[in-house]
Interface confidence: medium
């Protein structure tokens, strides 16, 4: 089955700047600003565009050692980024993949809203565990706030 979860969260960072830092350079920036959440990102194949496979390594102590993500779409104009978790982490026994869509929308106050859609593709009739969705949401929030704090402290970066 397919289970869809929608998340919206706000940021004080302008949309274009957040997209550049969090999405386009996230592989480098996130392990630097949130080493407690992601220890490193390896490029397995591709140049960052659709079809690119990345391996995200988690620190010791983290539930799951790694996940592999496949980039599905990068839209620089509309600040959209789609990717799928295809291996590792929760993917395996009952979960086929997780398809994620992130859209960063500018707000009138100069900040932005992140609209995130997570589609969990389960095997057979299996359902998605609530704790998995909660953990995923908390992880995303942790990474976003770490990037946001970095950008607020480094006003010259990613402009």
């Amino acid at each position: 089955g397919v289970f869809n979860y929608e998340i919206e969260t706000t940021s004080v960072i302008p949309a274009a700047r957040l997209f550049k830092a969090f999405i386009l350079d996230g592989d480098n920036l996130v392990p630097k600003v949130a080493p407690q959440a992601i220890s490193s990102v390896e490029n397995i194949e591709g140049n960052g565009g659709p079809g690119t496979i990345k391996k995200i390594n988690f620190p010791e102590g983290f539930p799951f050692k790694y996940v592999k993500d496949r980039v599905d779409e990068v839209d620089h104009t509309n600040f959209k980024y789609n990717y799928s978790v295809i291996e590792g982490g929760p993917v395996g026994d009952t979960l086929e993949k997780i398809s994620n869509e992130i859209k960063i929308v500018a707000t009138p106050d100069g900040g932005c809203v992140l609209k995130i859609s997570n589609k969990y593709h389960t095997k057979g009739n299996h359902e998605v565990k609530a704790e998995q969705v909660k953990a995923s949401k908390e992880m995303g929030e942790t990474l976003l706030r770490a990037v946001e704090s970095y950008l607020l402290a480094h006003s010259d970066a990613y402009n």
């Epitope: 407690q36 010791e60 102590g61 539930p63 799951f64 050692k65």
Partner: antibody, heavy 119, light 111 residues
Framework: EVQLVQSGAEVKKPGESLRISCQGS????????IAWVRQLPGKGLESMGI????????RYSPSFQGQVTISADTSTRTAYLQWNSLKASDTGIYYC????????????WGQGTRVTVSS | SYELTQPPSVSGSPGQSVTISCTGT?????????VSWYQQHPGKAPRLMIY???KRPSGVSHRFSGSKSGNTASLTISGLQAEDEADYYC???????????FGGGTKLTVL
């Protein structure tokens, strides 16, 4: 319900070997690190080391390196803590506990295994 | 020696509030929102009471709350009850540390 169930109390003599166990249930055992935590009589909690059952990656705290061996068997969903030669100073309660979070809190805890080493 | 410092003991009367502190450094307590607190009754296994500085697991009373200022985290227990008498340990994630260290523990006595 996520649970860790430990083996029973042990009484041993100095120099003897011992292996205690911790069986996990209610979650994907291979995908969560398990820590072993020591509590000496009347003292606090000390983390001895952790293991990732999925590939048996093991990290020891410096003061326990070479003193104990941590292992795991995913087929039986069991983690182990082993001594080759016990000392009287190993007397205490040993807890296994699952690590969770981003990345690091301890929950749930096993009920503890009391180890007494005395001649 | 513990790298996370807790007072050895605190006490309070039923109905009062007590606060237990846990002081570390910017590499642990101050650097991340990853302090957790554990309650241990005599002869029992520890139990997670607070995680990520302020979050309560389901089943933990609202009388328990966590907070943090700088490099010091605090556990506050309000409306003190006899069953709160126990040892309390703090723990924090830290970067570049080879072992996972708990605070030395605080014995809470309900008078």
């Amino acid at each position: 319900e996520v649970q860790l169930v430990q083996s029973g109390a042990e009484v041993k003599k100095p120099g003897e070997s011992l292996r205690i166990s911790c069986q996990g249930s209610g979650y994907r055992f291979s995908n969560y690190w398990i820590a072993w935590v020591r509590q000496l009589p009347g003292k606090g909690l000390e983390s001895m080391g952790i293991i990732y059952p999925g590939d048996s990656d093991t990290r020891y705290s410096p003061s326990f390196q070479g003193q104990v061996t941590i292992s795991a068997d995913t087929s039986t969903r069991t983690a182990y803590l082993q001594w080759n030669s016990l000392k009287a100073s190993d007397t205490g309660i040993y807890y296994c506990v699952r690590l969770g979070g981003i990345p690091d809190w301890f929950d749930p805890w096993g009920q503890g295994t009391r180890v007494t080493v005395s001649s | 020696s513990y790298e996370l410092t807790q007072p050895p003991s605190v006490s309070g009367s039923p109905g009062q509030s007590v606060t237990i502190s846990c002081t570390g450094t910017s590499s642990d307590v101050g650097g991340y929102n990853l302090v957790s607190w554990y309650q241990q009754h005599p002869g029992k296994a520890p139990r997670l009471m607070i995680y990520e500085d302020t979050k309560r697991p389901s089943g933990v009373s609202h009388r328990f709350s966590g907070s943090k200022s700088g490099n010091t985290a605090s556990l506050t227990i309000s409306g003190l009850q006899a069953e709160d008498e126990a040892d309390y340990y703090c723990y924090s994630y830290a970067t570049g540390r080879p072992s996972r260290l708990f605070g030395g523990g605080t014995k809470l006595t309900v008078l």
